[in-house]
C-alpha cells in the first residue's frame, strides 16, 4: 500500500491529520459516502484540543461529525471507543427527540453553534468535516 | 492529455460472468476516485459503482450490489468491474469515469469510450 | 432516491437560435448539479458542474442556472458540433442519478 506524507490540495493539516471542511449541507449518510471516496472518514473527536482546532475552522455552525448510534450503541466511524473516549455533549444531550415530526428519532451527531454536541435527524443537509491520519499506509486490497 | 481506454466486453449468456478493465494515463491514478457508468441501448446513463483512490472503500448501486465488484489496481493504472450473475438488464455500455477531484462533487471530468456487454442466450 | 425529470425529450432548434433545457429534481440537490453532453457513439462530456460552473474548456455560450429542483442549460447560439443529447446528473445525494435527456436536433 501506499503511505500519505502530506495532506492533500485544500486539506488543512493538524497533529498528524487532515482534515477538510465542507462549504455546503449534505445529509449524514452523503457526507459519509464523500469522506469515504476520498480514503478518510467523518472527523473523530478523541481529544479537548482537536475539538478546538475543528471548532475554530467551522466557525458557529452546525456540522457533521463521525458519530451516530443507527445500530443502537453510540459509535464512531473509525471503531474508536465511545465509552471511553472524549465527548463534549451539550446538556440533557443525546436525548434521541421524536418530537421533530420528521419520523424516527435522532441517531447522528453534529457540533452546534456553540461547538458543543448534538444528536439530530440524519438527513438534516449539514456541513461536515473529513478526517485522514498521515504516515498511515492506505490498505489498497489484493485484487482476486 | 488524460486518456480512459476500457476493454472486456462482449456476449455472455444469463448468469456468467465478465471482467471489464479500464486503463488510465495522463494523470495521478492513485490520487482520483474512479467510477463505472452503464448505459444501455438507447437509453439514459446509469451510475453503478465507485472506488477510492486507495481502493480501501467501494460503493454500489443497489441494482448491481452483490454481483458486481470494483477493485483497482494502482500499480497498473487500471480499474477494474468484475460482472457475476449476469442479467438481460445488465445490457448496456459500460463507461469508466474519473471523478472530478473536488471533495464533494461527484461528477465525472473523464469518461472512456465504453465497452458494450451484450447478455442474451 | 432521486429522480431527475428532463424537459422537453426533444428540442427542435434552427442553427443560430437559442436553446433552453429544463431538468427538475425531486427533492432539492442544492446546486449539486452537472450537465453532460453526449454525441451519437461518443461518451458524455462534462459541461457543467455546481450548476452554473462551466467546465474547463467550455466556450462561454454554455451555460447552467438554478438550485434547489429547477435547473436550465442555455446554449446560446447553436451551431452544428451542438445538436446532440444532453443529460443532467445530482451528486446531492447518493446514489447519484441522471436524468433521461434532452436531444437538440435541427429545426
Known amino acids: 500500500g501506499s503511505e500519505r506524507t502530506c495532506c492533500p490540495v485544500n486539506w488543512v493539516e493538524h497533529e498528524r491529520s487532515c482534515y477538510w471542511f465542507s462549504r455546503s449541507g449534505k445529509a449524514w449518510a452523503d457526507a459519509d459516502n464523500y469522506c469515504r471516496l476520498e480514503d478518510a472518514h467523518l472527523v473523530v473527536v478523541t481529544s479537548w484540543e482537536e475539538q478546538k482546532f475543528v471548532q475554530h475552522h467551522i466557525g458557529p455552525v452546525n456540522t457533521w461529525m463521525g458519530l451516530h448510534d443507527q445500530n443502537g450503541p453510540w459509535k464512531w466511524v473509525d471503531g474508536t471507543d465511545y465509552e471511553t473516549g472524549f465527548k463534549n455533549w451539550r446538556p440533557e444531550q443525546p436525548d434521541d427527540w421524536y418530537g421533530h415530526g420528521l419520523g424516527g428519532g435522532e441517531d447522528c451527531a453534529h457540533f452546534t453553534d456553540d461547538g458543543r454536541w448534538n444528536d439530530d435527524v440524519c438527513q438534516r443537509p449539514y456541513r461536515w468535516v473529513c478526517e485522514t491520519e498521515l504516515d498511515k499506509a492506505s490498505q489498497e486490497p489484493p485484487l482476486l | 492529455e488524460v486518456q480512459l481506454l476500457e476493454s472486456g466486453g462482449g456476449l455472455v449468456q444469463p448468469g456468467g460472468s465478465l471482467r471489464l478493465s479500464c486503463a488510465a494515463s495522463g494523470f495521478t491514478f492513485s490520487s482520483y476516485a474512479m467510477s463505472w457508468v452503464r448505459q444501455a441501448p438507447g437509453k439514459g446513463l446509469e451510475w453503478v459503482s465507485a472506488i477510492s483512490g486507495s481502493g480501501g472503500n467501494t460503493f454500489y448501486a443497489d441494482s448491481v450490489k452483490g454481483r458486481f465488484t470494483i477493485s483497482r489496481d494502482n500499480s497498473k493504472n487500471t480499474l477494474y468491474l468484475q460482472m457475476n450473475s449476469l442479467r438481460a438488464e445488465d445490457t448496456a455500455v459500460y463507461y469508466c469515469?474519473?471523478?472530478?477531484?473536488?471533495?464533494?462533487?461527484?461528477?465525472?471530468?473523464?469518461w472512456g469510450q465504453g465497452t458494450l456487454v451484450t447478455v442474451s442466450s | 432516491e432521486i429522480v431527475m425529470t428532463q424537459s422537453p425529450a426533444i428540442l427542435s432548434v434552427f442553427p443560430g437560435e437559442r436553446a433552453t433545457l429544463s431538468c427538475r429534481a425531486s427533492q432539492s440537490v442544492s446546486s449539486d448539479l452537472a450537465w453532460y453532453q453526449q454525441k451519437p457513439g461518443q461518451a458524455p462530456r462534462l459541461l457543467i458542474y455546481g450548476a452554473s460552473t462551466r467546465a474547463t474548456g467550455m466556450p462561454a455560450r454554455f451555460s447552467g442556472g438554478g438550485s434547489g429542483t429547477e435547473f436550465t442549460l442555455t446554449i446560446s447560439s447553436l451551431q452544428s458540433e451542438h445538436f446532440a443529447v444532453y443529460y443532467c446528473?445530482?451528486?446531492?445525494?447518493?446514489?447519484?442519478?441522471f436524468g433521461p435527456g434532452t436531444k437538440v436536433d435541427i429545426k
Open positions: 469515469a474519473k471523478f472530478f477531484g473536488v471533495v464533494g462533487v461527484g461528477c465525472f471530468d473523464y
Open positions: 446528473q445530482q451528486y446531492s445525494n447518493w446514489p447519484f442519478t
